[in-house]
């Protein structure tokens, strides 16, 4: 009765358990009773990342600069190339097949987390006491200017999009204050 199963680094073919090819190599010929499995290394731009019985190696991924992609890690005979996005762009998926421009945070919003090659900018609304008057992919919400520390008074209240406007203290009120 021929075998119906094989060990993990083997595969069943013609009632034989043959050795799988190691990562980085492809199958050239199956084993026989008297000859071992024949494997050959993958070519320059090819890889296989598992113990396998593949007759063709996989092509390394191409990081297309026209799609905003660049090589993050060069592929080997055992690993695929890893692509990432050019500065200012991020991947649209985990496989990083294309890139999109980092989102900017509108006025009234600040950057909570700066974008990376794989994640977009995360914005947050500026809370009371903070503002952002620019559209930016880097700027956080800034605190309102403290007029008091400059010995000035608030002439115009701040908003989430504008800073407070400080002005000189009223001379008369200032004078009475000291009497």
């Amino acid at each position: 009765e021929p075998p119906t199963a094989c060990r993990e680094k083997q595969y069943l073919i013609n009632s034989q358990c043959c050795s799988l090819c190691q990562p980085g190599q492809k199958l050239v010929s199956d084993c026989t009773e008297f000859t071992e499995t024949e494997c050959l290394p993958c070519g320059e731009s090819e890889f296989l990342d598992t113990w396998n019985r593949e007759t063709h190696c996989h092509q390394h991924k191409y990081c297309d600069p026209n799609l905003g992609l660049r090589v993050q890690q060069k592929g080997t005979s055992e690993t695929d190339t890893i692509c990432t996005c050019e500065e200012g762009w991020h991947c649209t998926s985990e496989a990083c097949e294309s890139c999109v421009l980092h989102r900017s945070c509108s006025p009234g919003f600040g950057v909570k987390q700066i974008a990376t090659g794989v994640s977009d900018t995360i914005c947050e609304p500026c809370p009371v006491g903070f503002f952002s008057n620019v559209s930016s992919a880097f700027e956080k919400c800034h605190p309102w200017t403290s007029c008091e520390t400059k010995d000035l008074v608030v002439q115009q209240a701040g908003t989430n999009k504008t800073d407070v406007v400080c002005g000189p203290q009223d001379r008369l009120r200032h004078h009475h204050h000291h009497h």
Partner: antibody, heavy 127, light 107 residues
Amino acid sequence: EVQLLESGGGLVRPGGSLRLSCAASGFTPGSYEMNWVRQAPGKGLEWVSYISSAGETTDYADSVKGRFTVSRDNSKNLLYLQMNSLRAEDTAVYYCARDVFFFDSSGDNGAYGMDVWGQGTMVTVSS
Amino acid sequence: DIQLTQSPSSLTASVGDRVTITCRSSQGIRSSLAWYQQKPGKPPKLLIYGASSLLGGVPSRFSGSGSGTDFTLTISSLQPEDFATYYCQQLNSFPSTFGQGTKLEIK
């Protein structure tokens, strides 16, 4: 230290059942294929069963097929052999043994061997 | 199933002797063969895998050779601790099988 320790052996009547356990220490058994091998008193070694590292593939000697079931609990580092419909000829010392794949990337195909064995547990089937 | 036949079944030799044990397979198994040493009351101990590769820690007086159907285990110069029973095992396909054993006794 890498060790395997069998337990669960004993005296059982013909037709009875027994469950053997094999506890692994010093290594992660979930990364290895495992076997049960037995040895009747004064006799040679007889391979009994095999289980793959995740437990999805099993195989058995013809003499125990349909009566014995091998299983594993990788979260507890345990290997089991459920033995049903026991016969007098199942009387033996039962060893659990680790399958290891020896591989040198500069070499060719690699090779298997059983490099770690437990001390064994005695199973006696008698009326 | 693949049958393994060891010869001789028993062997008497002296310390310092060169000893050869053979293992013949009923069908070709390439180099999927291991050799074990077993002493009374103890579990087997792996010596050689892949027909000819010596396990780390095993003395270099042990060597294995062969491929296909004919295999040999050689002990170049017997030491007192080498007197034991030796088994070959095929790991080519299931069911895995062992030879019947060769008992090496002191003369």
